[in-house]
């Protein structure tokens, strides 16, 4: 995977929250849930209230990248999804407010959001070859592809 210095000269400026309170389901129709405080995992749920609700904030790149760059926050909290290394769980990082500017090593908070039909992919800005992924009997992590599941459906307006 790419080192953190890869995009260290690029500055990302916060624009606005573009989605509120959505659920992420993987290709096996498992929802992302919050497990054991600082990790996320995927589970088939009878009760969707157990699924994490996310907010998505958009950032603009100083190099005018065509990609949509986003931050993912657990709704009604100050917890942000943070990338580590390949096959490592993503962490929940607590911050007092959404960062106005992100650069250098802090790009582990950012993801490139791509959509292909109903499929959504979140690539780590810090590790551009790695995606947010679910893995059987494991935490939500960063992975390059199969056997991890890297495509998600966004479920909005869940009552």
């Amino acid at each position: 995977s790419a080192p953190f210095s890869f995009l260290s000269n690029v500055k990302y400026n916060f624009m606005r929250i573009i989605k509120y309170e959505f659920i992420l389901n993987d290709a096996l129709n498992q929802s992302i849930i919050r497990a054991n405080d600082q990790y996320l995992t995927a589970a088939a749920l009878h009760n969707l209230d157990e699924a994490v609700k996310f907010d998505m904030g958009a950032y603009k790149s100083s190099k005018d990248d065509a990609k949509i760059t986003v931050i993912l926050r657990i709704s009604k909290t100050q917890l942000y999804v943070t990338a580590q290394d390949e096959d490592q769980p993503v962490l929940l990082k607590e911050m007092p407010e959404i960062p106005k500017t992100i650069t250098g090593s802090e790009t582990n908070l950012l993801f490139f959001w791509e959509t292909h039909g109903t499929k959504n992919y979140f690539t780590s800005v810090a590790h551009p070859n790695l995606f947010i992924a679910t893995k059987q009997d494991y935490w939500v992590c960063l992975a390059g592809g199969p056997p991890s599941i890297t495509d998600f459906q966004i479920l909005e307006n869940q009552a």
Epitope: I33, R34, N36, E50, I74, S75, L79
Partner: antibody, heavy 122, light 107 residues
């Protein structure tokens, strides 16, 4: 079916320790935090703390800090609570409870053990 | 730490009555409030989570409401099997404090 089965009642003398077990089944043990709550006779519920079943890290309520220890045996999906320097005021029913986040933000305890009665008497 | 104050500590009502219990948090808990029922000699059971969401299998006569620091638990029509002690609990931040409980009796 999710189940939390606790060890049997204990009678202890003041000053010694007690260790209560809580065996989980019906779910992946390391996915959900385990809490310990006690209830003195005729009293309310008192949160003692919790253990992260994946990392083994514990957080203890201030009133129990230094006197309580939570441990795990992940091979048997069992959580343990040990309370030391027992005194008569520790006479209570001790519950383990599985924690869950709703919406990823709001924490509740949706499965409870049957409780273990600990009596401290000289 | 967040303190939870529950009232009343006990109440007596007749079958069919509407019963209301209140819980006040020492600071805003953003609707992260749960209610539990504990019958005599039994383990606590989660009834309501996130202020107003009914836990699966819980009868619809139980409900919850509120926001900020003030929350209410209601039994719309009291049944004999509802005799129990009810506890609120904040689920926003550690330590996860409980209210002191409300003991409900039948007149």
């Amino acid at each position: 079916e999710v189940q939390l089965v606790q060890s049997g009642a204990e009678v202890k003398k003041p000053g010694v320790s007690v260790k209560v077990s809580c065996k989980a089944s019906g779910y992946t043990f390391t996915t959900y935090g385990m809490h310990w709550v006690r209830q003195a006779p005729g009293q309310g519920l008192e949160w003692m703390g919790w253990i992260n079943t994946y990392t083994g890290e514990s957080t203890y309520a201030d009133d129990f800090q230094g006197r309580v220890t939570f441990t795990l045996d992940t091979s048997t999906s069992t959580a343990y609570m040990e309370l030391s320097s027992l005194r008569s005021e520790d006479t209570a029913v001790y519950f383990c409870a599985r924690g869950i986040y709703y919406y990823g933000s709001s924490y509740a305890m949706n499965y409870w053990g049957q409780g273990t009665t600990v009596t401290v008497s000289s | 730490d967040i303190q939870m104050t529950q009232s009343p500590s006990s109440l007596s009502a007749s079958v069919g009555d509407r019963v209301t219990i209140t819980c006040r948090a020492s600071q805003d808990i953003s609707n992260m409030l749960n209610w539990y029922q504990q019958k005599p000699g039994k383990t606590p059971k989660l009834l309501i989570y996130y202020t107003s969401r009914l836990y699966p299998g819980v009868p619809s006569r139980f409900s919850g409401s509120g926001s900020g620091t003030d929350y209410t638990f209601t039994i719309s029509s009291l049944q004999p099997e509802d005799i129990a002690t009810y506890f609120c609990q904040q689920g926003k931040t550690l330590p996860y404090a409980f209210g002191q409980g409300t003991k409900l009796e039948i007149k």
